[in-house]
Interface confidence: low
């Protein structure tokens, strides 16, 4: 059992009240994290409650507002950057929200020298990026689709690139499907470690097919947004990467990083760069079919002016059984000689842990091992190497932070976190400041989160930033569920599970279930965090069991759960759903009449084929902006598991994993299908299939969908969702108003 | 700011060797190309060669191969070309320039007269 | 080699008119990543010479307006919008998309 916030004495339990909706409507339980904005080993900045930017000297305790919220609000801004000269800082306002990490904004630069405004060559508005190179303060940023740098801020701009045109060819950033699926960011330019070079991608969306959806809007005719998007099988972005040297930038101008060769003999993604030092940079590819990735360090010649690429730098990771990698290929985090490196992927026992490569992947060393895997790699100095992995005690939705020391022989291990406040924190991130001379600890639960500042070299808390006692004294007179994580072992597959348990819960009699469902490849929903959320007020308010299984497809367990579902997306994911269902129905006390099922997107998939299963398990479902056919969904995620949807690859099985095929399935569930019509992402065409195929075969089932709403479902149609998902379980399962 | 100091003229003999000197000072020397281009009396520019200080690797326009060294001294900041063989259709002005994006840096020149 | 061939090799002006001097390369110096690797330069009576445009139609730090750059692949342009006296000198074309660089003969540009 998992020990949630003190409770009050039972004297005080009658002034206890259960979670309402309206609480976690108007994110009442919300929590604060505090990562600090480091400039320094020793400072960081950080916008305080009444919104100054203030930075902090931790080893002089002192700070000073460098920015007065004043200045904030004179632009309205809602972000800032300091120069790393600290002379300047870049205001960010009118914030436009465009895909999952992209936006565009208007951007003020203000010197700290003079307390003015840079007036004169002002920045064009609205920017997509904008960044201060990583020494000094010249700037680089993206208008157009193109790239331009400045010297200094008051500096007129030097164009880079020409070419960039909407939708067709971008510059800096990235299309929509890089974005999404392989960079994770809203940029794709990198500043080498002092500011000499930027490298840039550029991707060609000419040869795209183009994703067309109405936006209502307010006008007489609707508008048509269109977004090149390749689904499975369709052309495909075609991708370069320039690098510029930024003190002369017109003397060569760009120069093109030349592609593997193995890689450039068929299609292929970029998929990270990082930079070495000033003149060696790291460059990774992937085949379209995404089981080999190239790793490729690139040196600068001088001679002429060119990057040069050898194949003695070049590392390939190849994987048998599945994809190459997690979720994404891992990136390399190098040592201080410049060359070698540290990187996560599979051991030969099938678990992804560190292994430190010196010249070619078949000689790695091996770091890390055991059932269990390295997560993340946060930092390496000279003489330790800090990362996170769910070792401890054998829970894998936990994560600590270990550090390793490289520097003696042979390399000892040290929990960092494992005992620092237990029952509250088994679930950690970190940031670390220059040299990791100090760092934060985020704790995301299983108790109320909270974040400390510790000392790099002997990992003692220095003090706790961020405690959150204001929610710890909201909570007190709150009934929270009770939650347990807790694992099933079936046919040789270990099911981990989360159980959110109404407060008095009581074992003899009988509550309904609802699963929460995503499934999707490499993720995890059985994690040790806290949260108030909907499925807890659920279980506070209306008496529900709510449980999260990770089955075959997750992630953190080792290669056998997570290659199980290579080029068989639709199948394992929901057996393991519905065997542990089964398996609760014989813990006694879930009523079987009262099962339902839900989930989001990868999860509205597969509620879809549990409801649609046949097994008669369930009495209800909803399914939100699911997808219906990996047809319908992008290349580079839905290839990456499925492969192509071609008679001579995989076709066969992309046909019969459709939600549609199984529309007669439907008739014996109730059936609530959800969708936003502006849904960039997991395209409304999903759902309009599956409404199409239950019309079609005369299945009654209900429908909302969301207009101008985007995949997120934001702002007031999260409350109506909410609130319509509510009233529909509560009827399912009989429960009164 | 940036300044190339050439050494002085030099009056030869046919089948001699020539060294000019090329010392930059005020800028960084060693990343950017230190570029060397000849004169003859009333006729154009011709390209002769280059070298990146940084690498030491030189570059010869194909004319010249062979009879042409070009090297640098990153500590000095100084660039170096060697013409051997001379003959009388080398006498010229010798420039080293540095290249560097939206502005450029010549020497003074060095007048290289080859008489018997 | 890449051989540069400029057309006039003389050309006489009034000051206050407009002068325009071509460039003709015998390969592309249309580089991949979009650049045109041809500059411009001036050398006037008894100095070293100056850069003007690079990269085909950017004006070189502290150059006049009244100089422009054109031109892609193989035919490039150099226009004075109206003739100063201090013009007067000899411009030079030169490519810089091969390792091995090459100039044009050179127009020699005199006042009337």
């Known amino acids: 059992i998992v020990l949630r916030p003190s409770r009050v004495h039972n004297s005080e339990e009658n002034t206890m009240r259960a979670l309402t909706l309206k609480d976690i409507l108007n994110g009442t339980f919300s929590y604060k994290t505090f990562f600090p904005n480091w400039i320094s080993g020793q400072e960081y900045l950080h916008q305080s409650a009444d919104n100054n930017i203030v930075l902090y000297n931790i080893e002089t305790g002192q700070s000073y507002t460098i920015l007065s919220n004043r200045t904030m609000k004179s632009v309205n801004a809602s972000n800032y950057g300091l120069s790393p000269d600290r002379q300047f800082v870049y205001l960010e306002s009118d914030y436009s929200k465009l895909w999952r990490y992209s936006y565009t904004a208007t951007y003020y630069i203000y010197d700290l020298s003079n307390g003015e405004f840079v007036r004169g060559n002002e920045l064009p508005r609205p920017i997509q990026y904008l960044c201060w190179s990583p020494v000094g303060s010249k700037l680089a940023y993206v208008y157009q689709n193109n790239i331009y740098l400045k010297q200094r801020p008051g500096d007129p701009p030097f164009q880079i690139t020409f070419n960039g045109r909407e939708n067709k060819i971008f510059n800096g950033i990235p299309d929509w499907v890089y974005e999404e699926e392989m960079l994770a960011t809203k940029y794709a330019l990198w500043w080498s470690p002092n500011g000499k070079f930027l490298a840039y991608a550029e991707f060609n969306d000419t040869d795209i097919p183009v994703i067309a959806y109405s936006y209502y809007g307010d006008e007489q005719y609707p508008r048509t947004i269109n977004i090149p998007y390749p689904k499975a099988g369709a052309k495909n972005p075609v991708v370069r990467i320039f690098i510029i040297d930024t003190t002369y930038p017109a003397y060569v101008g760009p120069q093109e990083v030349p592609v593997p060769a193995m890689i450039a003999s068929s299609d292929y993604y970029f998929s990270w760069l990082t930079w070495v030092t000033d003149e060696r940079v790291c460059l990774q590819w992937l085949k379209r079919v995404q089981n080999v990735s190239v790793l490729s360090i690139c040196d600068f010649r001088e001679d002429w002016q060119t990057w040069d690429c050898p194949k003695t730098q070049e590392h390939i990771e190849e994987s048998r059984t599945g994809w190459a990698g997690g979720f994404f290929v891992s990136t390399p985090v190098f040592s201080y000689d410049a060359i070698s490196y540290y990187k996560i992927f599979s051991d030969k026992d099938g678990y992804k842990h560190i292994h430190y490569i010196k010249d070619t992947v078949e000689n790695a060393i091996q770091i890390t091992s055991g059932k269990w895997e390295a997560i993340n790699i946060f930092r390496v100095t000279q003489d330790s190497l800090f990362y996170s992995s769910n070792e401890f005690e054998e829970y894998p939705g936990r994560r600590n932070i270990y550090r390793i020391s490289i520097g003696s022989y042979p390399p000892s291990k040290k929990c960092v976190t494992c005992h620092l406040r237990k029952e509250r924190c088994q679930y950690y991130t970190a940031s670390f400041s220059d040299y990791a001379k100090y760092y934060a600890l985020v704790c995301y639960g299983p108790g109320i989160p909270i974040s400390t500042l510790h000392d790099g070299r002997t990992d003692q808390e220095i003090k706790i930033l961020e405690e959150n006692k204001e929610l710890e004294n909201a909570l007190k007179n709150i009934q929270l569920p009770k939650e347990e994580i807790k694992k099933l072992e079936v046919d040789e597959i270990t099911l981990w599970y989360k159980m959110i348990l109404p407060p008095q819960f009581d074992r003899s009699k009988k509550y309904p279930l609802l699963i929460q469902v995503y499934g999707g490849p490499c993720s995890q929903s059985v994690r040790s965090v806290f949260a108030v959320n909907w499925i807890s007020y659920l279980a506070s308010k209306e008496g529900m069991v709510i449980a999260l299984v990770d089955g075959r497809g997750t992630a953190f367990q080792g290669d056998k759960l997570l290659y199980a579902v290579y080029r068989k997306l639709g199948v394992y994911e929901v057996e393991d759903q519905i065997t542990a269902v089964r398996k609760f129905i014989e813990m006694g006390f879930i009523d079987e009449k009262r099962i339902a099922i839900w989930g989001w997107s990868y999860g509205g998939y597969v509620s879809s084929l549990a409801l649609a299963s046949g097994t008669g398990l369930f009495k209800c479902g909803i399914a939100v902006a699911p997808v219906s056919s990996w047809e319908y969904y992008a290349s580079v995620y839905t290839e990456r598991f499925m492969g192509l949807p071609t008679k001579d690859d995989n076709l066969e099985h992309y046909k019969n994993s459709t939600v549609m095929a199984r529309a007669e399935y439907f008739r014996n569930v109730d059936y609530l299908l959800i969708h936003g019509t502006a849904d960039d992402n997991v395209h409304f065409q999903n759902s309009a299939q599956i409404a199409k195929a239950l019309v079609n075969a005369q299945v009654d089932f209900q429908a909302m969908w969301y207009s101008d709403q985007n995949h997120g479902l934001s702002g007031l149609s999260t409350n109506h969702l909410y609130t319509h998902m509510t009233h529909f379980l509560k009827q399912c399962f009989s429960l009164s108003d | 700011q940036v300044q190339l100091v050439q050494s002085g003229a030099e009056v030869k003999k046919p089948g001699s060797s020539v060294k000019v000197s090329c010392k930059a000072s005020?800028?960084?020397?060693?990343?950017?190309?230190i570029s060397w281009v000849r004169q003859a009396p009333g006729q154009g520019l011709e390209w002769m060669g280059g070298i990146v200080p940084n690498v030491g690797v030189a570059t010869y326009a194909q004319k010249f191969q062979g009879r042409v060294t070009i090297t640098a001294d990153k500590s000095t900041s100084t660039a170096y070309m060697e013409l051997s063989s001379l003959r009388s259709e080398d006498t010229a002005v010798y420039y080293c320039a540095r290249d560097a994006a939206d502005r450029d840096y010549w020497g003074q020149g060095t007048t290289v007269t080859v008489s018997s | 080699d890449i051989v540069m061939t400029q057309s006039p090799l003389s050309l006489p002006v009034t000051p206050g008119e407009p002068a325009s001097i071509s460039c003709r390369s015998s390969q592309s110096l249309l580089h991949s990543n979009g650049y045109n690797y041809l500059d411009w330069y001036l050398q006037k009576p008894g100095q070293s010479p100056q850069l003007l445009i690079y990269?085909?139609?950017n004006r070189a730090s502290g150059v006049p307006d009244r100089f422009s750059g054109s031109g892609s692949g193989t035919d490039f342009t150099l226009k004075i919008s109206r003739v100063e006296a201090e013009d007067v000198g000899v411009y030079y074309c030169q490519q810089r998309n091969n390792k091995n660089r090459t100039f044009g003969q050179g127009t020699k540009v005199e006042i009337k």
């Open positions: 990269l085909g139609s």
């Open positions: 005020g800028g960084t020397f060693s990343p950017y190309t």
